[in-house]
């Protein structure tokens, strides 16, 4: 988790001096509490949107945007810690919107936005906005929390982001596999215009379970440049198991973006259909 | 937590025989296809060997006749025997389990002339 690269983050708006600093999301007000503290956030809304670097590079961000309630404690808004942990890892960063004037009630309700949080393909996030003062230990909470999934990178947006490209996803390897006589799959794909090598990775499962019954791994050297761009064709042995009928074949590249850890792709292959049973045929009809 | 560990590297004159192993923890090793990749300073992760599920073997060319890769289901290791080794075998070895995509830390393997 990080912040974008943004010159100068800033928080103010018209009637409103505010600066955005870093936070620990230790807020004093939790060690101090205070006797009048605000009232939580409202409508908070959480939404992708894409952001360049100084240098130039997309990366996808968490937009982050809320109201406040027109009641008589934004005279007691200090300001707002917003914090986003990231599930999978427990990872949190925070942000501290401190205010350096009174907010005073106007024509229109006060909304907030903040987009420089980067978040990362096909992750899920928790994101807290926490009104300041936090308020005393036995008192109404006044923060709003939303969880926030990332779509990942075969999304139209998100594959021409830095961190999608840089894990391969403007390569469209367009498998296809074929089921062949004795226990054979040829496997094709478009190779990309790199000289890495690539693995194959069969796994087989019998019909309708996830617990497979057969892994190959076949490793393919890396292509001389005329080969870019044409197809490679791989012939794989299946085990010979009764049932072991359902096969996945995944591709990894090794890309010098990504090294070990590129964006996969893969294509299923099906169990035969069974031919329906035939209704047995009674031995007499009857007359009715 | 998974964790895959690599042993067995060190330096050894060319000609001669090291064994690597990888032992799993937090998973097994039984039904999955093992590999064995290497990395030489500079260089991309070379592919070296492979087992399947079943126990059949895969081998780069560079290191037919001279590798041999072995699994142990029961032990949850992984070894590659590397026998007459050549100075071009330098290298740090990993172990990788491709379908969870796990690697090891990896090993140093140095071959002296």
């Known amino acids: 988790l990080r912040l974008l690269d943004h010159r100068a983050l800033v928080c103010s708006q018209p009637g409103l001096n505010c600066t955005v600093k870093n936070s620990t999301c230790l807020d004093d007000s939790w060690i101090h509490p205070r006797n009048l503290t605000p009232s939580s956030p409202k409508d908070l809304q959480i939404q992708l949107h894409f952001a360049h670097t100084q240098q130039g590079d997309l990366f996808p961000v968490a937009h982050i945007e809320w109201t406040l309630q027109t009641d008589a404690s934004i005279l007691y808004l200090e300001g707002a810690e917003l914090s986003v942990l990231q599930l999978n890892t427990n990872e949190r960063l925070c942000v501290r919107f401190e205010f350096l004037s009174k907010l005073r009630h106007h024509h229109r309700r006060w909304r907030f936005t903040f987009s420089h949080f980067v978040v990362d393909p096909d992750q899920e996030y928790e994101v807290t906005v926490h009104h300041l003062p936090k308020p005393i230990p036995d008192g109404d909470p006044n923060h709003q929390s939303k969880n926030f999934l990332v779509p990942d990178c075969e999304h139209a947006r998100m594959k021409v982001t830095t961190p999608c490209m840089s894990s391969g996803s403007l390569w469209d390897p367009n498998i296809t596999v074929e089921t062949l006589e004795a226990h054979q799959l040829r496997v094709s794909f478009t190779l990309w215009n790199e000289s890495t090598h690539y693995q194959i990775l069969l796994t087989s499962f019998p019909h309708m379970e996830n617990h497979s019954c057969f892994e190959h791994m076949h490793h393919i050297p890396a292509p001389r440049p005329e080969e870019f761009h044409q197809r490679s064709n791989v012939t794989l042995t299946l085990r010979n198991l009764k049932g072991c009928c359902r096969h996945q074949v995944q591709i990894q590249p090794f890309f010098s973006s990504c090294l070990n850890d590129c964006l996969r792709h893969s294509a299923t292959v099906s169990c035969p259909e069974m031919p329906d049973t035939p209704e047995p045929i009674p031995d007499y009809m009857p007359l009715w | 937590e998974v964790q895959l560990v690599e042993s067995g590297g060190g330096l050894v004159q060319a000609g001669g025989s090291l064994r690597l192993s990888c032992l799993a923890s937090?998973?097994?090793?039984?039904?999955?296809?093992v590999a064995w990749y290497r990395q030489a300073p500079g260089n991309q992760r070379d592919f070296v060997a492979s087992?399947?599920?079943?126990?059949?073997?895969n081998y780069a060319d560079s290191v037919k006749g001279r590798f041999t890769i072995s699994r142990d289901n029961a032990k949850t290791s992984v070894y590659l025997q590397m026998n007459n080794l050549k100075p071009e075998d330098t290298a740090v070895y990993y172990c990788?389990?491709?379908?969870?995509?796990?690697w090891g830390q990896g090993t140093q393997v140095t071959v002296s002339s």
């Open positions: 937090g998973t097994t090793f039984s039904g999955r296809a």
């Open positions: 087992t399947n599920s079943a126990g059949s073997t």
């Open positions: 990788n389990v491709p379908f969870y995509n796990y």
